[in-house]
């Protein structure tokens, strides 16, 4: 109905107009991660707060067992920030000895799981080498982009090292998605 | 009205359909900060350009006195990037002496102020240790997420050290929000 | 039509309501860059995958020759992530000799080209000094914000050094835009 005067007519209009307020949306915030069994050769998934504080799910977007469940097909904007913190890696020690080395790193992956598809799909990845020289370091990795998702798709956030995730504040580490 | 043919009817439809073009939106860009009085124990707030160059506010989203004023309740996507630049901190000097140390850091916080609520709410935080070894360093912190806001809420961007903000270009440091 | 019961009436309603599903949208993903001639004094532009894997363009948003072509005036959210990777710059070697130095850097710019306007407009810039001490480093720069664009505008992503871009995975380096 773009650019057209919007007026009642006896001709039916099939464009799926819908109220913005009823679109699936979620913003999840960090909680302390408890030690769990991880799948071999797969980064562990974070679990999330979905209703307290700044966190919410609405309009059939549900959170369950580390996954956001997509209730309706369409284009979604998906985002996450994970703040990592740690102590100096041995990277700097090896370096001081003058030998080149593979740096330590921190990685965040937003992953899509489709039940009818055997392998998860990596939608977004942020990965950073960490060869910090100070004794304590901290830094965020932010990701966000638009993807076409199908009803029933599941989204999760995986990280390279769950023990480095800063779980202290809901504004530092979060995960969200909304239907465009 | 999802998935339903949209046709005139004698039955009233209550879904709040509205034109996308009339939704509150703003994109603010950096201006040079002049030395001012800061609130005690609170990171200083940045002030912004709201009408020149790439900056704009529209549809009742107003900017005044460092705040974006939310004109209508709903779910908003809020984002900011702050580019910092500085010179080597003494962090590296201490480090060379072999003593562990608390690193210098740079922090951005997007804060919500609700008049009826005594304390500001931190919506988003990006914080990064800075133990750079080069003489001059520069780097951005980017934040963005969706929040449910109420009419009358105010948004601001606070930074850990206002004098390290790169104010030279409107594409390096910015702040925006739009109703979904 | 905000906050108003939506019912047919003999009075014409002019608000340009339109289905969300028919808005211009694109998500482009990295491909290996082939050596090309760059414009003098301008960062080289990346070219992109627009239809395989996670990449898509829809609703008249077209990709051609490194540019996303804007088919309709309006407010767009534009985003990109570029993951860079490299080897230690001589920056650290110079530093070890105790001399301050200009750091190496990595930069991403999202640029708008308007045919009727002689100069491209830089919409977003992420720039970071790189004085890594490890032998190999990698890190992403993420950008995203909302801009008012005109039909016919073209968007591209420019980088400071095309040879440092990580082209190995579609989730590491990407570029997208969607009409709000």
């Amino acid at each position: 109905l773009k650019g057209q005067e919007f007026a009642p007519s006896h001709q039916q209009v099939y464009a799926p107009l819908r109220a913005d307020g009823d679109k699936p949306r979620a913003h999840l915030t960090v909680v302390r991660q408890t030690p769990t069994q991880h799948f071999k050769n797969q980064f562990p998934a974070l679990h999330w707060e979905h209703e307290l504080g700044l966190a919410f799910t609405k309009n059939r977007m549900n959170y369950t067992n580390k996954f956001l469940l997509i209730p309706e097909s369409g284009d979604y904007f998906i985002y996450s920030q994970v703040t990592f913190r740690g102590m100096t890696s041995e990277c700097s020690e090896i370096r001081q000895a003058g030998r080149p080395n593979k740096p330590d790193s921190i990685t965040v992956v937003i992953t899509k799981v489709t039940d009818s598809y055997p392998e998860p799909t990596q939608l977004l990845m942020g990965t950073k080498s960490v060869c910090e020289v100070g004794s304590n370091w901290f830094q965020p990795i932010y990701l966000g982009a638009m993807f076409s998702l199908q009803e029933g798709d599941k989204l999760m956030v995986n990280v390279s090292d769950i023990s480095l995730v800063d779980y202290t504040k809901e504004d530092k580490t979060f995960f969200g998605a909304f239907l465009l | 009205l999802k998935g339903q043919e949209f046709a005139p009817s004698h039955q009233q439809v209550y879904a709040p359909l509205r034109a996308d073009g009339d939704k509150p939106r703003a994109h603010l860009t950096v201006v040079r900060q002049t030395p001012t009085q800061h609130f005690k124990n609170q990171f200083p707030a940045l002030h912004w350009e709201h009408e020149l160059g790439l900056a704009f506010t529209k549809n009742r989203m107003n900017y005044t006195n460092k705040f974006l004023l939310i004109p209508e309740s709903g779910d908003y996507f809020i984002y900011s990037q702050v580019t910092f630049r500085g010179m080597t901190s003494e962090c590296s000097e201490i480090r060379q002496a072999g003593r562990p140390n608390k690193p210098d850091s740079i922090t951005v916080v997007i804060t919500k102020v609700t008049d009826s609520y005594p304390e500001p709410t931190q919506l988003l935080m990006g914080t990064k240790s800075v133990c750079e070894v080069g003489s001059n360093w520069f780097q951005p912190i980017y934040l963005g997420a969706m929040f449910s806001l109420q009419e009358g809420d105010k948004l601001m961007v606070n930074v850990s050290d206002i004098s390290l903000v790169d104010y030279t270009k409107e594409d390096k440091t910015f702040f925006g929000a739009f109703l979904l | 039509l905000k906050g108003q019961e939506f019912a047919p009436s003999h009075q014409q309603v002019y608000a340009p309501l339109r289905a969300d599903g028919d808005k211009p949208r694109a998500h482009l993903t990295v491909v290996r860059q082939t050596p090309t001639q760059h414009f003098k004094n301008q960062f080289p532009a990346l070219h992109w995958e627009h239809e395989l894997g996670l990449a898509f363009t829809k609703n008249r948003m077209n990709y051609t020759n490194k540019f996303l072509l804007i088919p309709e005036s309006g407010d767009y959210f534009i985003y990109s992530q570029v993951t860079f990777r490299g080897m230690t710059s001589e920056c650290s070697e110079i530093r070890q000799a105790g001399r301050p130095n200009k750091p190496d850097s990595i930069t991403v710019v999202i640029t708008k080209v308007t045919d009727s306007y002689p100069e491209p407009t830089q919409l977003l810039m992420g720039t970071k000094s790189v004085c890594e001490v490890g032998s190999n480093w990698f890190q992403p720069i993420y950008l995203g914000a909302m801009f008012s664009l005109q039909e016919g505008d073209k968007l591209m992503v420019n980088v400071s050094d095309i040879s440092l871009v990580d082209y190995t995975k579609e989730d590491k380096t990407f570029f997208g835009a969607f009409l709000l």
Partner: antibody
Framework: QVQLVQSGAEVKKPGASVKVSCKAS????????MHWVRQAPGQGLEWMGW????????NSAQKFQGRVTMTRDTSISTAYMELSRLRSDDTAVYYC???????????WGQGTMVTVSS | DIVMTQSPSSLSASEGDRVTITCRAS??????LNWYQQKPGKAPKFLIY???RLQSGVPSRFSGSGSGTDFTLTISSLQPEDFATYYC?????????FGPGTKVEIK
Amino acid sequence: QVQLVQSGAEVKKPGASVKVSCKASGYTFTGYYMHWVRQAPGQGLEWMGWIHPNSGGTNSAQKFQGRVTMTRDTSISTAYMELSRLRSDDTAVYYCAVGGSYDAFDIWGQGTMVTVSS
Amino acid sequence: DIVMTQSPSSLSASEGDRVTITCRASQSISSYLNWYQQKPGKAPKFLIYGASRLQSGVPSRFSGSGSGTDFTLTISSLQPEDFATYYCQQGYSSPFTFGPGTKVEIK
């Protein structure tokens, strides 16, 4: 409004030290870098260094290293610049200046004339 | 250290004239270039930052341009109060350095 008020003129002998003060008002003293810039009679401007009043961290131009000491007293919002082993070519007006960013000088003190003469 | 040069070192102009002062850096300083005005016996006054952005309260007849190594300060229509010495200063890296100044005198 933002104001920087410096101490009065000084006359010193070669080899002595001078300490110039700069009292700040109208802004959060600990939030902004304080710079010191000097200007010899009839000459241009020369940056000496800065202090970050919050951390006390300093950075000075190579030519002054070992001779200049920048300190601050946050309780009275005052910065100090001490220059030791004075020579006749240190005769200059010494300015403190504060910037909204660490790389520029928005507001200047009125200047302190330091004369080095035997 | 980054060396800043200015030209001319002095110029004579009349009220209403358009005046241009150039500043060159010995290496690229991006847009980290500031301009100051100084009158005899007074502290300098901050005019322009980021090469081209006017400091609050500075008249619009002042403008700046340039990026990298070459910069310009322009006064579109010289006023009596504009007769002074103008300095450029790079804020790109330490030590921050000033140009030698350009003295604008009454013709």
